[in-house]
């Protein structure tokens, strides 16, 4: 069942799914100047059986200028750099990711994909939070959020994480205002994951991670 809302936003933190539950959908988005091929699916879908999960459908982008062709346009140097970075990140992720039953790994990049990945999570999905560089974590509990369903309505649990600047006093600050509305559901923001393309920064973030490599950030 799709989560009809999004993981809470924690100030100075990003979130990441270590693996994606079966049923998760990823939009096939293309970068500017490209579009999804006409016969292509608008989504990739994490699907599987009891022993193996994988992404159904492959996203394919073609030049917007092209007519009924999937011929790829030779990328400019900066585009090549961006793609190479994404591929390196993907390899890092795959090496780091655990194989969870009923879950898919981060899908590899496709040619001319958009810099932003939009996932549609399902009930039972867990995402993990990490403070951005320059901020440190103050925990009161797990720095994770789980999509749950109650009475047909979906909601994400509130992660017990506060990110404080390195120069700020070390005493525990007040609890961050929860992202839940008075009627008990979190704010409906988009599950937008933006691929980070600065590999230097990415490596530094990755080096500080204990459980997984962060290659995306919450938008």
């Amino acid at each position: 069942e799709l989560c009809d809302d999004d993981p809470p936003k924690i100030t100075h933190a990003t979130f990441k799914a270590v693996a994606y539950k079966e049923g998760t959908m990823l939009n096939c988005e293309c970068k500017r100047g490209f579009r999804r091929i006409k016969s292509g699916s608008p989504y990739m879908l994490c699907t599987g059986n009891s022993s193996h999960s994988s992404w159904d459908n492959q996203c394919q982008c073609t030049s917007s200028a092209a007519r009924n062709t999937t011929k790829q346009v030779t990328p400019q140097p900066e585009e090549q750099k961006e793609r190479k970075t994404t591929e390196m990140q993907s390899q890092m992720q795959l090496a780091d990711q655990v194989s969870l039953p009923g879950h898919c790994r981060e899908p590899p990049p496709w040619e001319n994909e958009a810099t932003e990945r939009i996932y549609h999570f399902v009930v039972g999905q867990t995402v993990y939070y990490q403070c951005v560089q320059g901020y440190r974590a103050l925990h009161r509990g797990p720095a994770e959020s789980v999509c749950k369903m109650t009475h047909g309505k979906t909601r994400w649990t509130q992660p017990q994480l506060i990110c404080t600047g390195e120069t700020e006093p070390s005493q525990f600050p007040g609890e961050e205002e929860p992202q839940a509305s008075p009627d008990g559901l979190p704010e409906s923001e988009t599950s937008r994951l933006v691929t980070t393309t600065d590999f230097r920064i990415q490596t530094e973030v990755a080096a500080t991670m204990e459980t997984f490599i962060f290659t995306t950030e919450y938008q």
């Epitope: 799709l2 009809d4 049923g23 979906t154 559901l185 409906s188």
Partner: antibody, heavy 116, light 106 residues
């Protein structure tokens, strides 16, 4: 109490556009996605898409991607759906429905008639 | 897209009858939701997550099923139950509905 109040019926010429509104009250507008569902005369329900009011992010049924544009105005707690290049086949009742899971609250519907 | 096929399309019944509507999904889904609609009115949530009754819905309504086959049952049809019923899946985009089952007076 939660209410979704839609704009009144419209009669439009083929090729024109129409913008249907859905004003929400009784809950935090930005806390729930707003979905739109179409029902042609004597037909079933078709999901068109949704908007996340806080971010303005939209997701569409591919069938309506080039037909509908969903927007929202946080300041007035109102969601909108604009239909372009109207044809007779677009004659239908258009409903807004509160998301966050199952559609527990619906607008009363707006009948859009496309006729020359 | 997941196609939802309801049967029957029309059902003629009398007050007191036991009524069963089935909905078949073209792929396995997590849950089925059911809506009731009366002429000129917006749909109303009836059953969510396959078998849970929405607020204010009488206990004569029940839902069951799993995977691709789901059922809505009205144990003893009442005058207020003559309406059109729609099944609905929200396991994957695009969200889809069944074509509807009209329960009419016999």
């Amino acid at each position: 109490q939660v209410q979704l109040v839609q704009s009144g019926a419209e009669v439009k010429k083929p090729g024109s556009s129409v913008k249907v509104s859905c004003k929400a009250s009784g809950y935090t507008f930005t806390s729930y996605r707003m979905h739109w569902v179409r029902q042609a005369p004597g037909q079933g329900l078709e999901w068109m898409g949704y908007i996340s009011p806080r971010k303005g992010y939209t997701e569409y049924n591919q069938k309506f991607k080039d037909k509908a544009t969903i927007t929202a105005d946080e300041s007035t707690n109102t969601a909108y759906m604009e239909l372009s290049s109207l044809r007779s086949e677009d004659t239908a009742v258009y409903y807004c429905a509160r998301g966050g899971g199952v559609f527990d609250y619906w607008g009363q519907g707006t009948l859009v008639t496309v006729s020359s | 897209d997941i196609q939802m096929t309801q049967s029957p399309s029309t059902l003629s019944a009398s007050v007191g009858d036991r009524v069963t509507i089935t909905c078949s999904a073209s792929s396995s889904i997590s849950y089925m939701h059911w809506y009731q609609q009366k002429p000129g009115k917006a749909p109303k949530l009836l059953i969510y997550t396959t078998s849970e009754l929405a607020s204010g819905v009488p206990a004569r309504f029940s839902g069951s099923g799993s995977g691709t086959e789901f059922t809505l049952t009205i144990s003893s049809l009442q005058p207020d139950d003559f309406a059109t019923y729609y099944c609905h899946q929200r396991s994957t985009y695009p969200l889809t509905f069944g074509q509807g089952t009209k329960v009419e007076v016999k």
